[in-house]
Structure formats: C-alpha cells, structure tokens
Interface confidence: medium
C-alpha cells in the first residue's frame, strides 16, 4: 500500500525565544528515499530540514531516525523567531537513480504561530 | 458561549436534495474546521465532511462523495451541506461540529436535525 | 482508514459501581484519542481528549488512558447522569475522522 504521512497536529503555538516540536510519523520506509521538511508551498516552500544527513541551525530530530524501523520524523525546532511562523510541511520522497529525487506523499501540514514574549 | 443551530432537515424522497445549515455563534467562525457528523436511527456517529475556516480545505467521507458538498460563509458564520440524490441509508440526525483549532476532535455540537429520505 | 472498536457493547451496572470501558485502534494513533458521552435525544459531550485529557468542566470521576492501540475510559463511581453511551474517536489520522462503535452504559 501507498505510504502515508502524518501530521497531527492541525496548528502549534510557540512563544518567541521557545523551542517547538512538529510530529510527522510515516507508515513505511519504503520506497528507499529521504523525509524532508518544508516551510510553505509552491514556489515559495523553503527547505526546512532534511534527514539526510545535513546540518540545520536550531533544528534536529526527535527521535533516532538511523534506529532500524524508525517511522517519527518528527523536528524540534528551537530558539523560535517571529520569521519562523507558516505552515509546515512533512515530505516523503522516492530516490532517483540519476534523476531528482520524486516527491510521493506529504502531511497535511502544521502551522506555526509565533507569539510575542 | 458557544453555539450551533442546524436546520434544514425534513422528509425528503430517495433521489431529491436538502440543503442543511448551521448557524454559529459565541466564536471567530472563520479561524475554525467545522464538520458535518451524522447518526442514523439507533446507531452510532459517522464523521461525513470537513471544511477549513478559509474553506480551502474540504474532505467527505467515500458514502457521500459526489453527492454532499459543504460550504460555508464566514460573512454570516454559517455552514452549509448541499446533500444531492439522496438515499434511504442517508436517513439520520445530521450535527454540525466545531474542531478544536489544534486537533481534529470535537469541542461542540449542535442539537442535530433530522433528514429521513423515504418514499 | 483506521478502525476503532469499542467493548462490551452494552455494560450493565449499578450507581455507585465502577465503569471500565474499552477501545482498541487498528493501528497506533499514539495518544490522539477522544471520548464523548451521548444521552438520548442529545449531542454528544466532549469528555476526554489526548487519551488522558479532561475536556472542561468534565468530573474528575471520569478518567482517561492508554496510548497507541488500548484505550479506556473509566468512571470511577457512576451517578445517575452517567448512565449514556460513550463513543471514542481517533483524530491521528487526516480524514476520515472515525469513530467507535459505542458503550451503551444502562442501569442494573
């Protein structure tokens, strides 16, 4: 069956300077290919965080993602500014062999509202 | 305080349409999901559609798609449910449901209305 | 879709008797996990959410646990305004939302 990724939470709200986590879970690794996280859609969605390996400021992983049979790809993203406020997406992608990666599925999104402290 | 008045239902026969709304109150209407949750004679819940408060976001439950369509009107903070060929199965009380605005569970229900599709 | 069933159907008791209702998910849904309370000719009541949670102004007689596919809902000595049918409802999943079939909690 068709991977599935989920995102619980509709909406999270985090004040200014505060650390937030975002929960995505997926039914299956497969097909072989990276979860990444994006902020927006469309021509303005911005790269968030990859579990691939690179290092993003402010943001790491909840759980042990090289643990065998890991499914949480959950993110925490911490010291949060008004400028990280927006929807958030969870994105699952099939490799490619030369070509770019495909994306296949991603969550239903989670928006970050950002309060003054 | 919150409130939901559904209205609209009635005897209708297998095939025809109602149009069912909800009028909300004692809340900002267009910063929440709203659903329609419907509940046959005797049995339990069965969740039918959801709309975002944009009203971008629109799901239905396989036993309604192509026949239900929900809308909304955030100018006059009601909701709407355009119920097409309509079926003996159908036959429920029909609630509108207000979402927490951080999870898809529900914190207030109307009183329901009653739609009974016979011939 | 995830499937959500709930035991015993009917559950006869007394007041005062403790109540200890079951729902069980198809697959986790973590602790994503409400509970309502129907009486006749009414709508539904939010009871519990987040598995644990209790909705506002809801007794503390009732109580919620468990996480992933076990659920229960427990009230700790019944009164006469508990006596209803209580369904669970998952919201882990996008939709479609779904609920349990019920417990119908009647006197002894």
């Known amino acids: 069956t068709e991977v599935k990724v989920t995102q619980p939470e509709k909406s999270v709200s985090v004040a200014a300077g505060d650390s937030t986590i975002l929960n995505c879970t997926v039914t299956s690794l497969l097909p072989v290919g990276p979860i990444r996280w994006y902020r927006g859609v469309g021509q303005s969605r911005l790269l968030i965080y990859s579990f691939t390996g690179e290092h993003f400021p402010r943001i790491r992983n909840v759980s042990d993602t090289t643990k065998r049979n890991n499914m949480d790809f959950s993110i925490r993203i911490s010291n949060v500014t008004p400028e990280d406020a927006g929807t958030y997406y969870c994105v699952k992608f099939q490799r490619g062999s030369s070509e770019p990666d495909t994306e296949i599925q991603s969550g239903g999104g989670t928006e970050v509202y950002v309060l003054a402290k | 305080e919150v409130q939901l008045v559904e209205s609209g239902g009635g005897v209708v026969q297998p095939g025809r349409s109602l149009r069912l709304s909800c009028a909300a109150s004692?809340?900002?209407?267009?910063?929440?999901?709203v659903n329609w949750v419907r509940q046959a004679p005797g049995k339990g819940l069965e969740w039918v559609s959801l709309i975002s408060g944009s009203g971008e976001i629109i799901y239905y439950a396989d036993s309604v798609k192509g026949r239900f369509t929900i809308s909304r009107d955030n100018s006059k903070n009601t909701l709407y449910l355009q119920m097409n060929s309509l079926r003996a199965e159908d036959t429920a009380v029909y609630y509108c449901a207000k979402e927490n605005n951080r999870y898809r569970f529900f914190d207030d229900w109307g009183q329901g209305t009653l739609v009974t599709v016979s011939s | 879709e995830i499937v959500l069933t709930q035991s015993p159907g009917t559950l006869t008791l007394s007041p005062g008797e403790r109540a200890t209702l079951s729902c069980r998910a198809s697959?986790?849904?973590?602790?994503?996990l409400a509970w309502y309370q129907q009486k006749p000719g009414q709508a539904p009541r939010l009871l519990i959410y987040?598995?644990?949670s209790r909705a506002t102004g809801i007794p503390d007689r009732f109580s919620g646990s468990g996480s992933g596919t076990e659920f229960t809902l427990t009230i700790s000595s019944l009164q006469s305004e508990d006596f209803a049918v209580y369904y669970c409802?998952?919201?882990?999943?996008?939709?479609?939302?779904?609920f349990g079939g019920g417990t119908k909690v009647e006197i002894k």
């Open positions: 004692g809340f900002t209407f267009s910063s929440y999901d």
């Open positions: 697959q986790s849904v973590y602790t994503y």
């Open positions: 409802q998952q919201y882990y999943d996008r939709p479609p939302l779904t």
């Open positions: 987040g598995a644990s």
